[in-house]
Structures are given as structure tokens and as C-alpha cells.
Interface confidence: low
């Protein structure tokens, strides 16, 4: 049998084979050693017995899509049946105190390969033998600890294969410079050591994509925006657009990248070399956001011009013969670059929202019958922008970290957006008060520290920062979410 008989049905064309040469990979026309590495068709009953205690699942992932010329990395992780794991020696053991449907196992080993390899004979001093080879007969590389690697992974794509000895997780990187654009299929077959042979335990395939477009994604965030994922934002507040380029192999690390923005609101084109930009929409409505990313990326060099005709007789050379076997014009310039582009488009909706909230006055409410240890405090609050429909106060310790009390209630506010919020404080001391006004699309927060005095008629309430605002600067990027009466801070990055 040949590798292509064993590893997959997809047969690439001769053109594909010729134009998709992967560095370090071998042609799947090579012979496969079926005696050492038996081949089972899909549905063969022997698959059921290939692993003790269940089936092993191979999970193949890649960091696709890959920009042509960059490296794409494939990772295969083996998922063992419940209660099984690989130990430091590469043996498969039952997890301690893990109960599967068979109950607790007395034998700690599922597979004790250390014992197998220690008593295996017929090897010379190098540890090399007829069975320490890959399916094509190449010997295993003797990395330190290679004996603890009990799985053989065979990767197959584009008419070529790559063999790797490993543990329960392996990683393989492939340069995509010679790979045809578009979706391609990677198939992996995994074998486990079984005495002096190998047994197939899993097969997995995954589609990966090679593209000439830079993969681009944009995150959008805005202070006071209640839901950053719904692409609805607030008028008159800056939106931060952050461009994420999917470049896991850092192919574009040394490229100059330009970002060309059109915000769809007749503000024209905005060109930047910074991946983050702020933009404020001053009108309500729906706008089409467009981004074009341009990078000068390493790329194939144009074919060299044809060499000049050879002179009829030899010319004196500057150095010994053979120093420069190529004519100067034929020496490739390895630093050729090609412009690559990426595009992103989104439709965003701009609406009114609560832009700002301030506590302008704090007043201790004199109670006719004061509670034993309780103070009522009124906060006079103003806001700008749309009219809030709810107010939440979170009372916490002076560090603003440990919530002591949280209350939300609907509010009915006039056009002037002036309201009074009354809250009770148990006991004297310093408190952090987070006050949030919200409507359907926005949340605006202000914070202040207040000092509640003892219930002494002579004492009076002090606000740490008179005039309101309090810790507003610290908290302005903070988002408050509430569900019933359980409240937590969520930092909104």
C-alpha cells in the first residue's frame, strides 16, 4: 500500500502536487508499512477494540485562516475515555478517585508502556530497532525522552504527508508560501504503540483556509453603552474601534500596516497607522462602517530578468573560479514585498443615550424618629442626554470593592433630568456609592465616597468630594450590570 491509499480519498491533481510543495513533507506515493501500522477501514469492528475502556477522540485544530506566506499551525489533542490520562512517563493511567461506569480501577495503568519498552529485546545500544520506525520506514528521531512518546501522528494534505512521534498532544507548523489559495483538507491518523507494532486509535480531518486577504476583525466599545455586542451605540460619545489582525505566526510583525477608515457619516476617509481609533457620531441613524487594512508583507519576488548573453571568451574574474556561480542579476533578493489587503464592514446604529451623570448634592435626612443605627441620605442627581428609566445604587466599602447593598428601581424623570435618590446606610463610617442611571441602550455611572457621621445631632454628613463627581474619573469606564438584587462590578475594557 501507498500513503495515499491509507490516508485519504481526496487525490490532488498533478498541478496541485507540483505547486503545493511543503517543506519537510514527503510525497504520498511512498510505501506504507502495513505490517507495523495496520490499516482499518471506517466501520471496521477492530476500531472498537483499539483502546481499552472506550474510544480515543483526536481533536484537530488549526489557527486558520492563514495569510499566504505565513505559517499555519495544526494541533492534535487526544481526548481519552473518562478517568484516563497520560502521566509524566507517557503511560496511560486511571485518574485517582475517578469513578467511571466500571467503578474504581484497582490497576493504575490503562497502558504501561514503560514496562513494555524496558523488556523489549532485539535493540542495539542506540535504542534503534526494526519497530522504532515511522510508516515509511524512517527511524524515530531520538529526542531526549523519546521513549516516553507512544503515539505516532501522520498528517496528510495536498498529496503529501508528515510523520511525528509524540505524546497526547502534538503541534505541526506548515509554511503556506506554496499552498493554493482557498480551503484545503488536513487529515491526521493517530497510532498507539502496541508491543512491537502500532494500532490505529483515531482519525480526524479539518478544513483550513489559505487566503491572500488579511484576516481582520474589529471590536467596538463605548463608555455608557449598555450592550457592546449589538452594534448600537450612543450619539455624542466617542466609540473606540480596535482592529485585530489574525496573524498567529507573526508574519506581519515587521510590516508597515495602514488602516483606512470610512465611518459612513460624511466625515471622509481617515487613514491611520494605529490599530485603535476613536470616532464620535453626532447624528442618530444607521451608518456603514468600512475599513481597509493594507500591509507590505514579505512575498514572492518577480522573476529575474533573463541573464545577458554570454561573452564569446572568458572574462577575468575578480575572485577564484566558482565564487559566484550565479550572475549577479540572478541572485534573488529575499526581501521582496507585496501589498496585502484586508477588509471589514459593519452597519452600526446610533441612538440617544445617557451621556453623563453627576451627584450635585448630598443631604442627610433628619428623621423624626431616628433608627438606632440607620441614616437616610438623599442624593440629588443630574444627567445629560436621554432620560433615564431606572436608577441603581451600589453601596460598598471605601475601596469600592466589597458590595454591602444594592438597590435598583424604576424612575420617572422630567426633561430637566433632575432627580433625588434616597438611600439608607446602616451605621456610621465611610462608604463608596456607585450610582447608575440607565435606559434601554445606555448606562451612565458616577461614584462618590461619603462619610456617614454618628447619630449625633451636632454632626453632619460629609461628601468626600463636594460638588459631586466623586470617583467619577476612576469609574467612568466601568459598566454596571444588575439582575434582580444581585449586583457586581464588571470592568469594561
Amino acid at each position: 500500500k501507498r500513503f495515499h491509499d491509507v490516508l485519504g480519498n481526496e487525490r490532488p491533481s498533478a498541478y496541485m502536487r507540483e505547486h503545493n510543495q511543503l517543506n519537510g513533507w514527503s510525497s504520498d506515493e511512498n510505501d506504507w508499512n502495513e505490517k507495523l501500522y495496520p490499516v482499518w477501514k471506517r466501520g471496521d469492528m477492530r476500531w472498537k477494540n483499539s483502546w481499552k475502556g472506550g474510544r480515543v477522540q483526536a481533536v484537530l485544530t488549526s489557527d486558520s485562516p492563514a495569510l499566504v506566506g505565513s505559517n499555519i499551525t495544526f494541533v492534535v489533542n487526544l481526548v481519552f475515555p473518562r478517568c484516563q490520562k497520560e502521566d509524566a512517563n507517557g503511560n496511560i493511567v486511571y485518574e485517582k478517585n475517578c469513578r467511571n461506569e466500571a467503578g474504581l480501577s484497582a490497576d493504575p495503568y490503562v497502558y504501561n508502556w514503560t514496562a513494555w519498552s524496558e523488556d523489549s529485546d532485539g535493540e542495539n545500544g542506540t535504542g534503534q530497532s526494526h519497530h522504532n520506525v515511522f510508516p515509511d520506514g524512517k527511524p524515530f528521531p531520538h529526542h531526549p525522552g523519546w521513549r516516553r512518546w507512544n503515539f505516532v501522528y501522520v498528517f496528510h494534505t495536498l498529496g503529501q504527508y508528515f510523520q511525528k512521534l509524540g505524546r497526547c498532544s502534538v503541534r505541526v507548523s506548515v509554511n503556506t508560501a506554496n499552498v493554493t489559495l482557498g480551503p484545503q483538507l488536513m487529515e491526521v491518523t493517530v497510532y498507539r504503540r502496541h508491543g512491537r507494532a502500532y494500532v490505529p486509535i483515531a482519525q480526524v480531518k479539518d478544513v483550513y483556509v489559505v487566503t491572500d486577504q488579511i484576516p481582520v476583525f474589529v471590536t467596538m466599545s463605548q463608555k455608557n453603552d449598555r450592550n457592546s455586542s449589538d452594534e448600537t451605540f450612543l450619539k455624542d460619545l466617542p466609540i473606540t474601534f480596535d482592529v485585530l489582525i489574525h496573524d498567529p505566526s507573526h508574519f506581519l510583525n515587521y510590516s508597515t500596516i495602514n488602516y483606512k477608515w470610512s465611518f459612513g457619516d460624511n466625515t471622509g476617509l481617515f487613514v491611520s497607522i494605529n490599530h485603535t481609533v476613536n470616532h464620535t457620531y453626532v447624528l442618530n441613524g444607521t451608518f456603514s462602517l468600512n475599513l481597509t487594512v493594507k500591509a507590505a508583507a514579505p512575498g514572492p519576488c518577480p522573476p529575474p530578468p533573463p541573464p545577458p548573453p554570454r561573452p564569446p571568451k572568458p572574462t577575468p574574474s575578480l575572485g577564484p573560479a566558482g565564487d559566484n556561480p550565479l550572475g549577479l542579476s540572478e541572485i534573488p533578493d529575499e526581501n521582496c514585498q507585496i501589498n496585502r489587503y484586508g477588509h471589514f464592514q459593519a452597519t452600526i446604529t446610533i441612538v440617544e443615550g445617557i451621556l453623563e451623570v453627576n451627584i450635585i448634592q448630598t443631604t442627610d435626612v433628619l428623621m423624626l424618629v431616628p433608627g438606632p443605627d440607620s441614616s437616610l441620605i438623599d442624593f440629588v442627581v443630574t444627567c445629560q442626554g436621554s432620560i433615564p428609566t431606572e436608577v441603581c445604587t451600589i453601596i460598598s466599602d471605601p475601596t469600592c470593592e466589597i458590595t454591602q447593598n444594592a438597590v435598583c428601581s424604576p424612575v420617572d424623570v422630567d426633561e430637566m433630568c433632575l432627580l433625588t435618590v434616597r438611600r439608607a446606610f446602616n451605621g456610621s463610617g465611610t462608604y463608596c456609592v456607585n450610582l447608575t442611571l440607565g435606559d434601554d441602550t445606555s448606562l451612565a455611572l458616577t461614584s462618590t465616597l461619603i462619610s456617614v457621621p454618628d447619630r449625633d445631632p451636632a454632626s453632619s454628613l460629609r461628601m468626600a468630594n463636594s460638588g459631586g463627581g466623586g470617583l467619577n474619573d476612576i469609574f467612568e469606564a466601568q459598566k454596571i450590570e444588575w439582575h434582580e438584587h444581585h449586583h457586581h462590578h464588571h470592568h469594561h475594557h
Epitope: 472498537k48 475502556g53 490497576d107
Partner: antibody, heavy 120, light 107 residues
Framework: QLQLQQSGTEVVKPGASVKIPCKAS????????MNWVKQRPGKGLEWIGQ????????NDNGKFEGKATLTVDKSSNTAYIQLSSLTSEDSAVYFC?????????????WGQGTSVTVSS | SIVMTQTPKFLLVSAGDRVTITCKAS??????VAWFQQKPGQSPELLIY???NRYTGVPDRFTGSGYGTDFTFTISTVQAEDLAVYFC?????????FGGGTRLEIK
């Protein structure tokens, strides 16, 4: 050809023990679980336990603890169940049945059964 | 241990009829349910494993379905040779347990 060969009938006295063989052929004995199932006349099926010949790992029904012991002899590809302190409640047909590793309870091939009669 | 409640206990049908047997597990057993056929005087035979997979060589008139606690076994067109007792069995939790059986008789 795949076979699980069991002895036909065993008649034993109350309080005695009996060891029932199940000889496997035609498949990789060490790579399948061997199960034992009890069936009393006109009654349903009761799973006693299973053993993995490859390493002797067992998985037992606690109800039969002290009653049934499962063993294997890999050299002869034979699994055994030993029933001890027999009473009339133990009179039944005992089947051996193999199951694949990852479907350890899906018994895909059964012996013809051994009838045990406990009688004085 | 898991109790498998199998209904009905008895079925009297004519050849060509469609037959459905149900099994209810006392708690979820995922899809780890098998169905067996036991003809008079014979050993049980595996028909369905993993709730819905037909075992090799089993005619396609036998089907299984279900997940969690409720499982169904169907014979789409009963034939004379289907006279037997049918058992469900869960093999998710040890000890593995069988239903009480359904005796199928042909008119």
C-alpha cells in the same frame, strides 16, 4: 468462526461450589470484555459482572459479591465463573457473552448457556 | 442501580404489524442502551447498541431511538420469525441492568 463454548448442564448440591467454563475461539480473546449473565427459568436477565482478559480487570455487580468470582486463563482462551455456597436461588442458566472495549455492556456474541441446578 | 422499566410485558400481533416497545430508565443513561432478542430455547442476540445503531447483520425493520431516560424499539413490519422475548439494557452505569422483557407472540 467465532464461538463461545459453554458446558451443558451442572447439577450440584446446596452449599457446594461450581466453576463454569466459557471457551472462546475465533477472535482476539484478550481484547474483549467477557460478561456473565444469569437467567432464572421464565425470568429476565441479570448481569453478574465482566472481566477483561487482557489484564484481569473486573467490573462486578455488587449483588453477586461473595457469590460469583470471575477469572480467565489466557493460555486456553477460557473465562470462568465460580459460584459458591449454592442455594436453590442460584438455579439458573448462566451465559457468557463478550463485549467490545468501548461498548463494554453491549454484548454482541453469547455462549449457548450452562444450566445449573442446585438440588440435594 | 438503574431500574429499566420496559412496557408492555406482552404483545400479540399479526404478521405485518408495526410494533413499538418502550423502556424508561430511572435516571439518564445517555444513549448507552442496547436491545436484545431471545428466541425460545436460545441465547439472547444483540439487535441494537448505543440506542440507535443496528448491529451487523440485523434486518433494517428493527430500529431503536431515544436518549437520556426514554428509549423506543420498533419492528416496522413483524414477521413470523420475530416471535421472541425482547430486552432492553442500559450499560451506562455499573451494574448494567436489563428491562423485564416483552414477549412478542404472533396471531
Amino acid at each position: 468462526q467465532l464461538q463461545l463454548q459453554q458446558s451443558g448442564t451442572e447439577v450440584v448440591k446446596p452449599g457446594a461450589s461450581v466453576k463454569i467454563p466459557c471457551k472462546a475461539s475465533g477472535y482476539a480473546f484478550s481484547s474483549y470484555w467477557m460478561n456473565w449473565v444469569k437467567q432464572r427459568p421464565g425470568k429476565g436477565l441479570e448481569w453478574i459482572g465482566q472481566i477483561y482478559p487482557g489484564d484481569g480487570d473486573t467490573n462486578d455487580n455488587g449483588k453477586f459479591e461473595g457469590k460469583a468470582t470471575l477469572t480467565v486463563d489466557k493460555s486456553s482462551n477460557t473465562a470462568y465463573i465460580q459460584l459458591s455456597s449454592l442455594t436453590s436461588e442460584d438455579s439458573a442458566v448462566y451465559f457468557c457473552a463478550r463485549s467490545p472495549l468501548h461498548l463494554r455492556g453491549s454484548m454482541d456474541y453469547w455462549g449457548q448457556g450452562t444450566s445449573v441446578t442446585v438440588s440435594s | 442501580s438503574i431500574v429499566m422499566t420496559q412496557t408492555p410485558k406482552f404483545l400479540l400481533v399479526s404478521a405485518g404489524d408495526r410494533v413499538t416497545i418502550t423502556c424508561k430508565a430511572s435516571q439518564s443513561v445517555s444513549n448507552d442502551v442496547a436491545w436484545f432478542q431471545q428466541k425460545p430455547g436460545q441465547s439472547p442476540e444483540l439487535l441494537i447498541y448505543s440506542a440507535s445503531n443496528r448491529y451487523t447483520g440485523v434486518p433494517d425493520r428493527f430500529t431503536g431511538s431515544g436518549y437520556g431516560t426514554d428509549f423506543t424499539f420498533t419492528i416496522s413490519t413483524v414477521q413470523a420469525e420475530d416471535l421472541a422475548v425482547y430486552f432492553c439494557q442500559q450499560n451506562y452505569y455499573s451494574p448494567f441492568t436489563f428491562g423485564g422483557g416483552t414477549r412478542l407472540e404472533i396471531k
